[in-house]
Amino acid sequence: KKVVLGKKGDTVELTCNASQKKNTQFHWKNSNQIKILGIQGLFLTKGPSKLSDRADSRKSLWDQGCFSMIIKNLKIEDSDTYICEVENKKEEVELLVFGLTANSDTHLLEGQSLTLTLESPPGSSPSVKCRSPGGKNIQGGRTISVPQLERQDSGTWTCTVSQDQKTVEFKIDIVVLAFQKASSTVYKKEGEQVEFSFPLAFTLEKLTGSGELWWQAERASSSKSWITFDLKNKEVSVKRVTQDPKLQMGKKLPLHLTLPQALPQYAGSGNLTLALEAKTGKLHQEVNLVVMRATQFQENLTCEVWGPTSPKLTLSLKLENKGATVSKQAKAVWVLNPEAGMWQCLLSDSGQVLLESNIKVVPTW
């Protein structure tokens, strides 16, 4: 008996061939022996089986001895043994229809779990193997679970259902709702304008929700809300903003915030949250602001940084075109009685300069 696997909602063609390449009488029946379709003269006739309005045959191939049955919009309950009767012989085809669906919405927040459920006919014992867009392989039986979705899980998942050495492939599009980056750090000299950008890792036709940026300044004992906003069909409108600092926000996506100037008292880290309409949970992106200040006071040249820096970052003071430098893995460096000239303050990570500020030291007579 031939086994054919089908996908719920799809179309399948069950083949039946006569030895002689000519138009002859044929019938397709189900396992109850109820007629689905057949030929009467030159016409296709349909019996009262449940398949009658979804079954058809390729009339153009009848004179070649091909009497296939096409079943449209497959349902799990179409799984059955179908019998083709032609030239006094019977051909049996076992059709097994499977469905694979995501248990919840296919638009899920980062960190949420994804469950794929296999619908299968009674008596079948299929196995399922799924491959994520990032190349992660997951195996299972009736259900496949991905406990914590990551950004890279966004895209088309390819799942293969196997039964009786036959396979059928399903493609499921999963959208992980997240910001493109989990965290970003902006490095600025004191007084410079600061641009924060929060690009999303997905696109939705209608994007509606609300968000807030909470800020924990390094110098402050507690965090405070800097701005709250609404998002309606990708249009951004500010609800409330603090007086100090007075942030500005772009009206279009990606979410964009401007801090008029970087000051040491603003250095710190923030958490932008975005709650989307009809979704439980929130999207998060951490943003850090590191501010540098270089000053000369009497005989002391000082370079300082404020904000969340890693202990492996190096802060250096260097006289231009001279070898004279002072370097430390610290948040402040200084030179006493500095030589006259253009001094550079550099914040670097393994040789890569993250932030630089120049200060001119004039000779003292």
């Epitope: 349909k46 019996g47 009262p48 449940k50 009658s52 979804r54």
Partner: antibody
Framework: QVQLQESGPGLVKPSETLSLTCSVS????????WSWIRQPAGKGLEWIGR???????NYNPSLKSRVTMSIDSSKNQFSLKLSSVTAADTAVYYC??????????????WGQGATVTVSS | DIQMTQSPSSLSASVGDRVTITCQAS??????LNWYQQKPGIAPKLLIY???NLETGVPSRFSGSGSGTDFTFTISSLQPEDFATYYC?????????FGQGTRLEIK
């Protein structure tokens, strides 16, 4: 056991739409096809068509242009609408269950029938 | 559509008689034929399915035979409750069609 009960107006004016509902009790409406059959007084049976819970329908070609069938699984009911009626549509209208099993296809459960008269 | 022709249209018989009704299909319907009984003011009742199989609870005096285009329905010994109208029905092809009926009356 499954029982069927037709309901609807007994009198319909010519050119109007005849509407009947069949209520299924004692069993689920799911998984079966449900037929409508009519019988003019003193005459034979005419199959109108059938519907199932997936809303698949088959209609008798002679009535197809005027027939609409619908099903409401939550109420365990299915309905028949026949538009542009004439006196020729006066009949007893039956609803019935289509049962399929091995070597068997038949209308095994019937309603008691609803008499519909088309007259102005 | 497949036409179903029953004969006779009506017949008179007595209790205890053997009665035969025939049904002819306009084309080959294999064994896809049912027989129904209908009493006045009551819905039809399925008696025989698949040309020759007795529905559960139907007395064995009722029988059916035939295949292709010619079918026969027999009551071996008429009982008072058997006086009714009998219909054949084909289910080989949609639309499902019925014979015009055979009215069985008391002689």
């Amino acid at each position: 056991q499954v029982q069927l009960q037709e309901s609807g107006p007994g009198l319909v004016k010519p050119s109007e739409t005849l509407s009947l509902t069949c209520s299924v009790s004692g069993g689920s409406i799911s998984t079966y096809y449900w037929s409508w059959i009519r019988q003019p007084a003193g005459k034979g049976l005419e199959w109108i068509g059938r519907i199932c819970t997936t809303e698949n329908t088959n209609y008798n070609p002679s009535l197809k242009s005027r027939v609409t069938m619908s099903i409401d699984s939550s109420k365990n009911q299915f309905s028949l609408k026949l538009s542009s009626v004439t006196a020729a549509d006066t009949a007893v209208y039956y609803c019935a269950r289509d049962l399929e099993r091995l070597n068997y296809y038949g209308m095994d459960v019937w309603g008691q029938g609803a008499t519909v008269t088309v007259s102005s | 559509d497949i036409q179903m022709t029953q004969s006779p249209s009506s017949l008179s018989a007595s209790v205890g008689d053997r009665v035969t009704i025939t049904c002819q299909a306009s084309q080959d319907i294999s064994k896809y034929l049912n027989w129904y009984q209908q009493k006045p003011g009551i819905a039809p009742k399925l008696l025989i399915y698949d040309a020759s199989n007795l529905e559960t609870g139907v007395p064995s005096r009722f029988s059916g035979s035939g295949s292709g285009t010619d079918f026969t329905f027999t009551i071996s010994s008429l009982q008072p409750e058997d006086f009714a109208t009998y219909y054949c029905q084909q289910y080989d092809s949609l639309p499902i069609t019925f014979g015009q009926g055979t009215r069985l009356e008391i002689k």
